[in-house]
Interface confidence: low
């Protein structure tokens, strides 16, 4: 339904606390570079305005598109061409062409020291002092680094922040209490932000219907017990919700989160039993609950796949009447039967059905051609499988830094172009995926495993395309979405690439490593053997393990020395010297 | 269908005990967190305490910080509270609620401390 003011509309339907706190991620996330002071003040501008449209929606201006009135705040920003270069250009637009401007000048890697947390006792004075500045500095510093950040779920993280707080600066130890809550959230809302900025890719990249495919399979997976009718509806109502979120429509994007979560609470029975229990929780909690409620019980009695999309004599006929409802059918059908396949990996094959039925329903006898097409299907889900049980094998028997270790060896051979500081970033993200995936239960592993890797693979890809340095990275960047992981899978060593030469102050440490916190040695560790991947791009596993060795044996012994100066600087030019000899 | 029902409540006096009992069926109540809270004559609900699934973890509102504890028994599909130097302001309707909602559904078990 329209409304004379959606301002007014909005600002009623979140109340004010959510409003705020969208305005600030929205605008946090169009111009990255602002201080939180300068976001809060036009925050108020606009909250204030919103009040007044709520008083009398005929006011004056009230009755403007949200990009507008945005947008008009935005241009109004002194200094805008000193502080953001060409990004001011935007703002000789006219809408829609002025928002679709301001999101191409989205920066995914904005020149942003890293978001240092405070000590303890610091956080608790300014938390007490004023809670919902601090939380909007929270929102500010993540909504600023994660551009695309899914903006209701950052309100929920920025509850979770606020929950620990409350509890955590009462206690004695508040450190020991902060830290292990506070390191999950973070871990937790980083896996969020790509998974999300993978969603909008799809959508910028491949548009709506890439993304209905995707949340077809997983709602499918989820819900196996609900019909298509209902599958197709979810997933419409999902796409419209990250639709407006990647597109910064944020007031649309939670009202309709917020909208679409009631209307699952209001139709469980349709849906899944498993509902219950996030229905019960507040607005931000069951949102987030939802999104990730287990998968229902399959249904016992289902038909083998075949059935319907191979034995059926009309399958041709069913295919060219309606062809996106009937392999909308085939991946929910085949999605709901195996919760234990990756989204990916479903979506591999409904191509893979799709490009067969193209094919077969073509030729003389069509049954005859696409009747081995479930079997086609085997190969496409043993290379995942075997992908899984590899790493993770890996994994067990090298620990989370050693199995990122080895990743960094193998991607920095595949694409010894790119950054050191980008492959050591992937690596160790994508080395995270054995404590994240490989613990679960055999039946939970393969999605867990490809659909992150994807995700973080998507980052890797538009890191690259500001700088692209690497025709191999291009090549599987180039594709699409799903094959992405596959095509990284199968890369070898880069032939054409001519190794760096060696600089002894690439290897060069001093004493100050030492004081370092072990993230940051196991950085400076990595960097160093990306180094010397790219150096050497054909040492073997064992010559590296080797200089690592030595390496960690080094810092080992200088960390511990009376005068570690000393140390650095006489035993430093020594592992320079076994490192080169090692690797010669 | 979801089913938490509490008991043990009653009339007291200041600096007395109770232990309140939830039992849960419907749901496998061993896979949730659980929490208490209480709803005082006029007031919103007031989150008291909450457990995690396995039990290991628990938390406590300031308020009643060392004088109530939580348990639960997974076999037993039960959720405990322990009320030790009850106070008046303690006197509230006390429900137990699946995760860290504040949202009831359930009947509750009233508390009253009173001389």
């Known amino acids: 339904e329209a409304h004379k003011s959606e301002i007014a509309h909005r600002y009623n339907d979140l109340g004010e606390q959510h409003f705020k706190g969208l305005v600030l991620i929205a605008f946090s996330q169009y111009l990255q570079k602002c201080s939180y002071d300068e976001h809060a003040k036009l925050v108020q501008e606009v909250t204030d305005f919103a009040k007044t449209c709520v008083a009398d929606e005929s006011a004056a201006n009230c009755d403007k598109s949200l990009h507008t009135l945005f947008g008009d705040k935005l241009c109004a920003i002194p200094n805008l061409r000193e502080n953001y270069g060409e990004l001011a250009d935007c703002c000789t637009k006219q809408e829609p062409e002025r928002n679709e401007c301001f999101l191409q000048h989205k920066d995914d890697n904005p020149s942003l020291p890293p978001f240092e947390r405070p000590e303890a006792e610091a956080m608790c004075t300014s938390f007490k002092e004023n809670p919902t500045t601090f939380m909007g500095h929270y929102l500010h510093e993540v909504a600023r680094r994660h551009p695309y950040f899914y903006a209701p779920e950052l309100l929920y993280y920025a509850e979770q922040y606020n929950e620990i707080l409350t509890q955590c600066c009462a206690e004695a130890d508040k450190e020991s209490c902060l830290t292990p809550k506070l390191d999950g959230v973070k871990e937790k809302a980083l896996v969020s932000s790509v998974r999300q900025r993978m969603k909008c890719s799809s959508m910028q990249k491949f548009g709506e219907r890439a993304f209905k495919a995707w949340a077809v399979a997983r709602l499918s997976q989820t819900f196996p017990n609900a019909d298509f009718a209902e599958i197709t509806k979810l997933a419409t109502d999902l796409t419209k919700v990250n639709k407006e979120c990647c597109h910064g429509d944020l007031l649309e994007c939670a009202d309709d989160r917020a909208e679409l979560a009631k209307y699952m609470c209001e139709n469980q029975a349709t849906i899944s039993s498993k509902l219950q229990t996030c229905c019960d929780k507040p607005l931000l909690k069951k949102a987030h609950c939802l999104s990730e409620v287990e998968h229902d019980t399959m249904p016992a009695d289902l038909p083998a796949i075949a059935a319907d999309f191979v034995e059926d004599q009309e399958v041709c006929k069913n295919y060219a009447e309606a062809k996106d409802v009937f392999l909308g059918t085939f991946l929910y059908e085949y999605s709901r039967r195996h919760p234990d396949y990756s989204v990916s990996l479903l979506l591999r094959l409904a191509k893979k059905y799709e490009a067969t039925l193209e094919k077969c329903c073509a030729e003389a006898n069509p049954p005859a051609c696409y009747g081995t097409v479930l079997a086609e299907f085997q190969p496409l889900v043993e290379e995942p499988k075997n992908l899984v049980k590899t790493n993770c094998d890996l994994y067990e028997k090298l620990g989370e830094y050693g199995f990122q270790n080895a990743i960094l060896v193998r991607y920095t051979q595949k694409a010894p172009q790119v950054s050191t500081p980008t492959l050591v970033e992937a690596a160790r993200n994508l080395g995270r995926v054995g404590t994240k995936c490989c613990t679960l239960p055999e039946d939970q592993r393969l999605p867990c495993v490809e659909d992150y890797l994807s995700a973080i693979l998507n980052r890797v890809c538009l890191l690259h395309e500001k700088t692209p340095v690497s025709e191999h990275v291009t090549k599987c960047c180039s594709g699409s979405l799903v094959e992405r992981r596959p095509c990284f899978s199968a890369l070898t060593v880069d032939e054409t690439y001519v190794p760096k030469e060696f600089k002894a102050e690439t290897f060069t440490f001093h004493s100050d490593i030492c004081t370092l916190p072990e993230k940051e040695k196991q950085i400076k560790k990595q960097t160093a053997l990306a180094e010397l991947v790219k150096h050497k791009p054909k040492a073997t596993a064992e010559q590296l393990k080797t200089v690592m060795d030595d390496f960690a044996q080094f810092l080992d012994t200088c960390c511990k020395a009376a005068d570690k100066d000393t140390c650095f600087s006489t035993e430093g030019p020594n592992l320079v010297t076994r490192c080169k000899d090692a690797l010669a | 269908q979801v089913q938490l029902v509490e008991s043990g409540g009653g009339l007291v006096q200041p600096g007395g005990s109770l232990r309140l009992s939830c039992a849960a069926s419907g749901f496998t109540f061993g896979s949730f967190g659980m929490s208490w809270v209480r709803q005082a004559p006029g007031k919103g609900p007031e989150w008291v305490s909450a457990i995690d699934s396995g039990g290991t973890d628990t938390r406590y509102a300031e308020s009643i910080k060392g004088r109530f504890t939580i348990s639960r028994d997974n076999a037993k599909k039960t959720l405990y509270l322990q009320m030790n130097s009850l106070k008046p302001e303690d006197t509230a309707v006390y429900y137990c609620?699946?995760?860290?909602?504040?949202?009831?559904g359930s009947q509750g078990t009233q508390v009253t401390v009173s001389s």
């Open positions: 609620t699946i995760g860290q909602s504040t949202s009831r």
